[in-house]
């Protein structure tokens, strides 16, 4: 039968080395066997490159395209093929569709004055445009009480957050995760980092009296 795209490709760039496109077919499809996504930078002399998609779900395909360090002027021509049949054609400008890389190595350390120090790593090297553009959202939640969670926006430069132990329930187990956003690029949020868990052993002052 005829091959059709139900939801056309939606693409995001990490603005350093990879762009990812995802789309949905109108029926379950073996993406790698049946489809190819070709991409070519709109730049004199550029070559046509081919991405072999993988299945994310039965009818959802995803393609990861290794691209060079992105710059604002870059525009790619994208063509989705099923054999010789062109299913979809469009253009993609990485700088206008940024999804930052996930922050890494989230750790929690006891700090002076009954505070916890949450630290993570900026996912971009210092020379990349996004390194100095990221702001973060940290989600802290009680593992045993879904109602007990807090969201912190970290808008300053350093990838750290100081958390007063007194703002959390004593003796409870908490998990934290972090994601990133690049405001000047009007990006989407990155994926959440893996969670890190710790026990909040802060004793309220009442227990000392």
């Amino acid at each position: 039968g005829s091959v059709k795209v139900l939801h056309e490709p939606s693409c995001f760039s990490d603005y350093i080395s990879t762009s990812v496109c995802q789309w949905k077919m109108d029926h379950p499809t073996n993406c790698s066997a049946e489809l190819r996504l070709s991409y070519q930078l709109d730049f004199m002399g550029s070559e046509n490159h081919t991405c072999v998609p993988e299945n994310r779900e039965d009818s959802v395909c995803v393609c990861s395209m290794p691209i060079d360090d992105a710059v604002e002027a870059d525009v790619y021509q994208l063509d989705l093929w099923a054999g010789q049949q062109l299913l979809w054609s469009g253009s993609f400008q990485p700088s206008k569709h940024v999804k930052p890389r996930t922050p890494g190595n989230l750790t929690v350390h006891p700090n002076i004055s009954h505070t916890w120090l949450l630290m993570w790593t900026n996912p971009y090297p210092t020379e990349n445009h996004l390194h100095s553009e990221l702001t973060y959202m940290v989600n802290v939640s009680n593992d045993n009480d879904p109602e007990d969670f807090k969201v912190y926006n970290v808008t300053y430069m350093g990838p750290t957050l100081r958390l007063a132990a007194s703002t959390l329930k004593s003796g409870a187990s908490y998990s934290a995760r972090v994601r990133a956003w690049a405001q000047t690029y009007n990006s989407t949020w990155s994926d959440w980092s893996p969670s890190t868990t710790w026990l909040n052993y802060y004793e309220p002052w009442e227990q000392h009296l």
């Epitope: 930078l41 002399g45 550029s46 070559e47 046509n48 490159h49 060079d68 710059v71 002027a73």
Partner: antibody
């Protein structure tokens, strides 16, 4: 050592055809775009055409579009320029030159970093 | 098409002096930060052209540091310091950003 050797230049009548060749050595030919540049007697340099490394994309100056065809044979490390419907104003020394590295997603640019010795095309009745 | 305009069209300089050639483009040649697609070439009498500078300011392999390129966007300059008799020839700027590639008219450098 990079070498580019052009050949095929000749005296031809207006309306005639000619095929220029440029044999390359000393670098990975298929990885680079190649360019033809010409120079009319006593005049400046004029870009003619460019072909990317795979041969999949070509570009032409308006003055030669529809008359000239650039092509390459990567197995033979050879660049070609097929010139049809030649005119007196096509009289020039034709140079081939190595252009940008095109195997990367964004071509890496080093200018026209190596040139051949040129071959003379004369169009006259 | 991008038009390239060179000034002056001829230049006479004494050995040891500095020669400067200007090149102006009708559109910006800045693709991204640090990437101006502007080259400089030298054609010595009776020879093929040779690359001197690419991307506005990067010296081609084997080119002495007496040759330097500067500028961004639409205005560029080639400077040749401590000019030698061997520097005589015609200097061309060229934009490599978009088709058609275009050259300046050329500047003839004569050593006094």
């Amino acid at each position: 050592e990079v070498q580019l050797v052009e050949s095929g230049g000749d005296l031809v009548k207006p309306g005639g055809s000619l095929r220029l060749s440029c044999v390359a050595s000393g670098f990975t030919f298929r990885d680079y775009a190649m360019t033809w540049v010409r120079q009319a007697p006593g005049k400046g340099l004029q870009w003619v055409s460019l072909i990317n490394g795979s041969g999949g994309k070509t570009y032409y100056a308006d003055a030669v579009k529809g008359r000239f065809t650039i092509s390459r044979d990567n197995a033979k490390n050879t660049l070609y320029l097929q010139m049809n419907s030649l005119r007196a104003e096509d009289t020039a020394v034709y140079y081939c030159a190595v252009d940008r590295l095109t195997k990367t997603v964004r071509p890496q640019y080093y200018g026209l970093w190596s040139w051949g010795q040129g071959t003379l095309v004369t169009v006259s009745s | 098409d991008i038009v390239m305009t060179q000034t002056p069209l001829s230049l006479s300089v004494s050995p040891g002096e500095t020669a400067s050639i200007s090149c102006r483009s009708s559109q910006s040649l800045l693709y991204s930060i640090g990437y101006n697609y502007l080259d400089w070439y030298l054609q010595k009498p009776g020879q093929s052209p040779q690359g001197l500078i690419y991307l506005g300011s990067k010296r081609a392999s084997g080119v002495p540091d007496r040759f330097s390129g500067s500028g961004s966007g639409t205005d560029f300059t080639l400077r040749i310091s401590r000019v030698e008799a061997n520097d005589t020839g015609v200097y061309y700027c060229m934009q490599g950003l978009q088709s058609p590639l275009t050259f300046g008219q050329g500047t003839k450098l004569e050593i006094k």
